[in-house]
């Protein structure tokens, strides 16, 4: 669809004659008629194949005709088609003398004809005009005429409809030759695509409209390119959606037992060795100096009273030493140099000669102790604590520092571990020697019976066109991971191709 | 050939939401090349346009019902759906599921076969 | 809103020719496209992307769209022809239809 435009610039008719050569009265009253068809190689009478269109009387004799497009569209002429444009024209152009107002054919003479063109040629679709002028004996007539395509036609023959639109069937403008040119962001034959953010991944990712992206399920992030793990995966990662693999140091379905307590805690103090031996469980070796579970607590050289025979002990950065009361000598005041003459024995305690007098021993009364009953009786030294529980003087009396897992004075009672209820989900507590086992109703497992025990819900191979399963554990149900070229929650949908143009 | 199957009650009273399914059958609801629409006609009437939606989720609704319409779409089932809430006596009417061609400008070259709704208590 | 306008009722004779027309301001830039609804059926499309026919449309169907007017026209037409007409187009995301017009072939 197009118009052949016709512009009329200038009639000469400068004796105002008529074909005939018979003189206008009073002069030529001049207007046109235009017939344009198909070519021909010798411009023949016949149907106006290609259309008609006539003028008002545009002057007299000789004149200039204006450019009245924005006017009421008189010139240029407009000579609208409704085909294929064939690049090939004839046209003929009559100027007749009107004598009245009644400008229809069948109301003039035939005589009345001032002068006739018919040309013919080739003429390709665009904005150029081509200029012609042509003379006859006593006129002249210049022009010049183009065609070009309707609104919304193109390509070199107008017969290409495209019309720009921007809504969801299609974000585009036309181009010259009636190609669609996509809006920016938008992509595909009919431009109804977005282009999605910038590394979206092709899988993992979509959009609905440009410089989205949109994840499908399992995977998260602004690319989607990070997968969803296990719900409850507390110290794990995954490659792949619902995945939970452990770091390091850590177990368990959801990684939230800890292997390694040693290196995540710390618990050692002052420079212990710390060693793992099991889960949330753990050994300190303490340095020279140190005692406690945790090595927390500093050890005196001189607790263990090291000293005799009433010698008092003193701390040094590299030990101990022992200050010896009179009649003493030697590293811990263990050498005599007194009798039972001297009056040794403190306390109440009894001497007895050894070695025809060169010696002697003290017994002591109860509560006392040492070689001259010098010291109170050390209530640790009969190792009363038992389980391996840490004895510790209080002045009068003891206390027993019990391990994890003993109470009692002397730590002799096993703490119950069922105690505290640790079997989840109705599970039975048995104790055990050391520690404690869980036994789980169906449909439970683990060491707590903390893991519901699910159905692989990716047995049946749910999942089309080589789509990889990923079972959720936490909901019994599955997920496909599509390949490219498919959708839907089986990936058994291929995605289809838009089909070809129609044009 | 692509088929469409519009199902659903038939009576539903004034106030409630009105809930039709469209079951595609002979091809797959997410082709790049198609939107899925609604469009309803009531007794004696002209149609009207709902909406539609596409298979990533995408919809697109008529202004003066959006406020009480959801379109949505199971790629799974190779269905979408309609619902239209706070329904009255004016939603009475034939409601067709169709769809709608990238390639034919957004013409709609395959309906379903409708099915009366009627809101009345 | 974007409203189009078809006239209520076209009457032709058999053999002739029926011309509907569907106005909406500047509908020439759009895609216009008819359907064609006889009582108790779905609607048909006839003409898609104002001139266009699908595969199985008669050739008697033709349309056309420019300025603020889509035309269907039929020619020859026959007594199967009779039923409502309705044009519709896409105004920015919102589909359109006319009110369409009855066809009676007297």
């Known amino acids: 669809s197009g118009v052949f435009q016709l512009q009329l610039q200038e009639f000469i008719n400068e004796r105002g004659v008529l074909a005939s050569g018979r003189p206008c009265e009073p002069g030529c009253r001049t207007f046109f008629r235009v017939c344009l068809k198909h070519f021909q190689a010798v411009v023949s009478p016949g149907p106006c194949t290609f259309g008609t269109v006539s003028t008002p009387v545009l002057g007299t004799n000789s004149f200039a005709v204006r450019d009245d497009s924005s006017g009421g569209g008189r010139n240029p002429l407009q000579l609208p088609f409704n085909f294929t444009w064939p690049g090939t024209f004839s046209l003929i152009i009559e100027a007749w003398h009107a004598p009245g107002d009644d400008l229809r054919p069948e109301a003039l003479p035939p005589d009345a004809l001032i002068s006739k063109i018919a040309i013919q040629g080739s003429l390709a679709v665009g904005q150029n005009w081509l200029l012609d002028e042509q003379t006859s004996t006593l006129t002249r007539l210049r022009y010049s005429y183009r065609v070009i395509c309707s609104d919304n036609y193109y390509g070199d023959n107008c017969s290409r409809l495209c019309k720009k639109r921007n809504d969801h069937f299609g974000h585009y403008v036309c181009q010259p030759d009636g190609n669609l040119s996509c809006l920016p962001g938008w992509t595909g034959e009919y431009c109804q695509q977005p282009i999605c953010l910038s590394g979206c991944h092709e899988q993992n990712g979509y959009c609905s409209k440009p410089a989205e992206c949109l994840c499908r399920p399992g995977w998260q992030g602004r690319l989607c390119n990070e997968c969803i793990p296990h719900n409850g995966c507390r110290h794990g990662t995954c490659s792949t959606p619902w995945q939970c693999t452990c770091d390091e140091g850590w177990g368990g379905l959801f990684c939230d037992q800890d292997l390694n307590y040693c290196t995540h805690h710390s618990p050692c103090k002052n420079g212990a060795t710390c060693s793992n031996s099991g889960q949330r469980s753990y050994t300190c070796t303490c340095r020279p100096g140190y005692t406690g579970v945790d090595c927390e607590l500093e050890l005196s050289e001189c607790d263990s009273n090291p000293c005799r025979n009433g010698g008092s002990c003193k701390d040094q950065e590299d030990g101990y030493h022992c200050l010896c009361p009179p009649g003493y000598y030697g590293l811990h005041c263990e050498h005599s140099t007194l009798s039972c003459a001297d009056s040794p024995c403190f306390n109440g305690g009894s001497c007895r000669e050894r070695n025809q007098g060169a010696n002697y021993a003290c017994e002591c009364p109860p509560n006392f102790t040492g070689s001259n009953c010098e010291k109170k009786v050390d209530r640790c030294t009969s190792n009363p604590c038992a389980n391996g529980g840490q004895c510790l003087n209080r002045g009068p009396s003891r206390m027993c520092r019990c391990r994890p897992g003993f109470t009692g004075t002397y730590c002799e009672l096993h703490v119950s571990d069922c105690a505290r209820n640790p079997c989840a989900h109705g599970g039975t507590c048995h104790d055990l020697e050391n520690g404690l086992m869980c036994t789980c109703p169906a449909g439970f497992s683990g060491r707590r019976c903390e893991v519901r025990t699910s159905i692989d819900a990716c047995a049946s191979s749910p999942c089309f066109n080589r789509a990889t399963c990923y079972t959720d554990l936490s909901t019994d149900t599955f997920v496909c991971n599509c390949p490219y070229g498919f959708v839907g929650s089986r990936c058994e949908f291929p995605v289809g191709l838009p089909p070809s143009f129609p044009w | 050939e692509v088929q469409l199957q519009e199902s659903g009650p038939g009576l539903v009273k004034p106030s409630e939401t009105l809930s039709l399914t469209c079951t595609v059958s002979?091809?797959?609801?997410?082709?790049?090349?198609?939107?899925w629409g609604w469009i309803r006609q009531p007794p004696g009437k002209g149609l009207e346009w709902i909406g539609d939606?596409?298979?990533?989720?995408?919809?697109y609704y008529n202004p003066s019902l959006k406020s009480r319409v959801t379109i949505s779409v199971d790629t799974s089932k190779n269905q979408f759906s309609l619902k239209l809430s706070s329904v009255t006596a004016a939603d009475t009417a034939v409601y067709y599921c169709?769809?709608?061609?990238?390639?034919?400008?957004?013409?709609?070259?395959?309906w379903g076969q409708g099915t009366l709704v009627t809101v009345s208590s | 809103s974007y409203e189009l306008t078809q006239p209520p009722s076209v009457s032709v004779s058999p053999g002739q020719t029926a011309s509907i027309t569907c106005s909406g301001q500047?509908?020439?830039?759009?895609?216009a496209s008819w359907y064609q609804q006889k009582p108790g059926q779905s609607p048909v499309l006839v003409i898609y992307?104002?001139?266009k026919r699908p595969s199985g449309i008669p050739e008697r169907f033709s349309g056309s769209n420019s300025g603020d007017t889509a035309t269907l026209t039929i020619s020859g037409t026959q007594p199967m022809d009779e039923a409502d007409y309705y044009c519709?187009?896409?105004?920015?995301?919102?589909?359109?239809f006319g009110y369409g017009t009855k066809v009676t072939v007297l």
């Open positions: 169709a769809r709608f061609d990238v390639s034919l400008g957004g013409g709609s070259d395959t």
């Open positions: 002979g091809g797959s609801i997410s082709s790049s090349s198609y939107y």
């Open positions: 939606i596409y298979y990533t989720g995408s919809t």
């Open positions: 500047r509908l020439g830039d759009k895609y």
């Open positions: 992307e104002d001139s």
């Open positions: 519709q187009a896409w105004d920015r995301d919102t589909g359109v």
